[in-house]
């Protein structure tokens, strides 16, 4: 059965913007004018996971690329990544729990919870022009808190 | 409170078709996964496959080329049709609801209606 | 096909911690639910999304899933807790369903 998908950006709530950095990595900077256009489009998938009123379990893809954020133990500690899988086969309904995140609204902002690693969160730095990572804190100083913005298909 | 009821000739001979149906009471119907299980008696569960309300389908490959699920949103219920029977197909088969609550499982059960395939 | 794998029976005696394991080719990396069935009746979901209780399922149920093995836990088990357990996974694009597990609870 098909998976229900949406087109959307995500800046972080100091509005900083997710670009590519390398093939497998994302960061995280400001961006203006013209620039913007670097940023990625992700293709959110609504998928198996917990579900509730303001969860939502979803995957994140790179729009027309066969990469999705994932989450894995790199030297005992769960990191999040690009994963290339096999584009005949992806999105489904019925995700592997590495690809899923927790979608979480609490006022009018979105936090996405590692499905895997329950309280791990996609997470960025406050500084500028850093990867995009699994931070296992919320409220410190790196930034789990996003805003979403959708793009026509 | 949910409620599925299900129904459907008991008793078959091989190369028969079998049809059971499945209604489902209260809840929504379009919100949901309807699925068919089936047991051998004595023996474990075995997944046939699922439906949606617009008919989109997941079958278990072993049963492909038998299977045939459906569905008539206007009267919530969904049907299993088994073709070429054997003796291999006595079973009691099940209809069941996948919920996204339950992270689209089997949350609601029907009675189970026990199919004899005999010559 | 996918393939997984439980004991075909364990035995506990009441008021004891009973485990029922559940082993498949990278079962971690995917949501495992449990369902007990009882003689002549239609199973009932026990454990859903690795670790997850279903309203009305006791807290003695519990879950975990890592690495190939997902496991059951019924902590202080009851006589009425003897019953066939099945635990259940994706598969690819199919779900799949252990061979069951008969728990005898005993005296």
């Known amino acids: 059965a098909p998976v229900r998908s949406l087109n959307c950006t995500l800046r972080d709530s100091q509005q900083k913007s997710l670009v590519m950095s390398g093939p497998y990595e994302l960061k995280a900077l400001h961006l203006q004018g013209q620039d913007m256009e670097q940023q990625v489009v992700f293709s959110m998938s609504f998928v198996q996971g917990e579900e509730s009123n303001d969860k939502i379990p979803v995957a994140l893809g790179l729009k027309e690329k066969n990469l999705y954020l994932s989450c894995v133990l790199k030297d005992d500690k769960p990191t999040l990544q690009l994963e290339s899988v096999d584009p005949k086969n992806y999105p489904k309904k019925k995700m592997e729990k590495r690809f899923v995140f927790n979608k979480i609204e609490i006022n009018n902002k979105l936090e996405f919870e590692s499905a895997q690693f329950p309280n791990w969160y996609i997470s960025t730095s406050q500084a500028e022009n850093m990867p995009v990572f699994l931070g296992g804190t919320k409220g410190g100083q790196d930034i789990t808190d996003f805003t979403m913005q959708f793009v026509s298909s | 409170q949910v409620q599925l009821q299900q129904w459907g000739a008991g008793l078959l001979k091989p190369s028969e078709t079998l049809s059971l149906t499945c209604a489902v009471y209260?809840?929504?119907?379009?919100?949901?996964?309807w699925s068919w299980i089936r047991q051998p008696p004595g023996k474990g569960l075995e997944w046939i496959g699922e439906?949606?309300?617009?008919?989109?389908?997941n079958y278990n490959p072993s049963l492909k080329s038998r299977v045939t699920i459906s569905v008539d949103t206007s009267r919530n219920q969904f049907s299993l049709s088994l073709s070429s029977v054997t003796a291999a197909d006595t079973a009691v088969y099940y209809c069941?609801?996948?919920?996204?609550?339950?992270?689209?499982?089997?949350?609601?059960w029907g009675q189970g209606t026990l199919v004899t395939v005999s010559s | 096909q996918s393939v997984l794998t439980q004991p075909p029976s364990v035995s506990v005696s009441p008021g004891q911690t009973a485990s029922i394991t559940c082993s498949g080719d990278k079962l971690g990396d995917k949501f495992a639910f449990w369902y007990q069935q009882k003689p002549g009746q239609s199973p009932v979901l026990v454990i859903y999304l690795d670790n997850k209780r279903p309203s009305g399922i006791p807290e003695r149920f519990s879950g975990s899933n890592s690495g190939n093995t997902a496991t059951l836990t019924i902590s202080g088990t009851q006589a009425l807790d003897e019953a066939d357990y099945y635990c259940?996974?994706?598969?690819?694009?199919?779900?799949?369903f252990g061979g069951g597990t008969k728990l005898t609870v005993l005296g």
């Open positions: 069941a609801r996948a919920s996204p609550s339950s992270g689209w499982t089997l949350d609601y």
């Open positions: 439906i949606d309300h617009s008919g989109s389908t």
């Open positions: 209260g809840g929504s119907f379009s919100d949901y996964y």
């Open positions: 259940q996974a994706w598969a690819d694009s199919f779900e799949v």
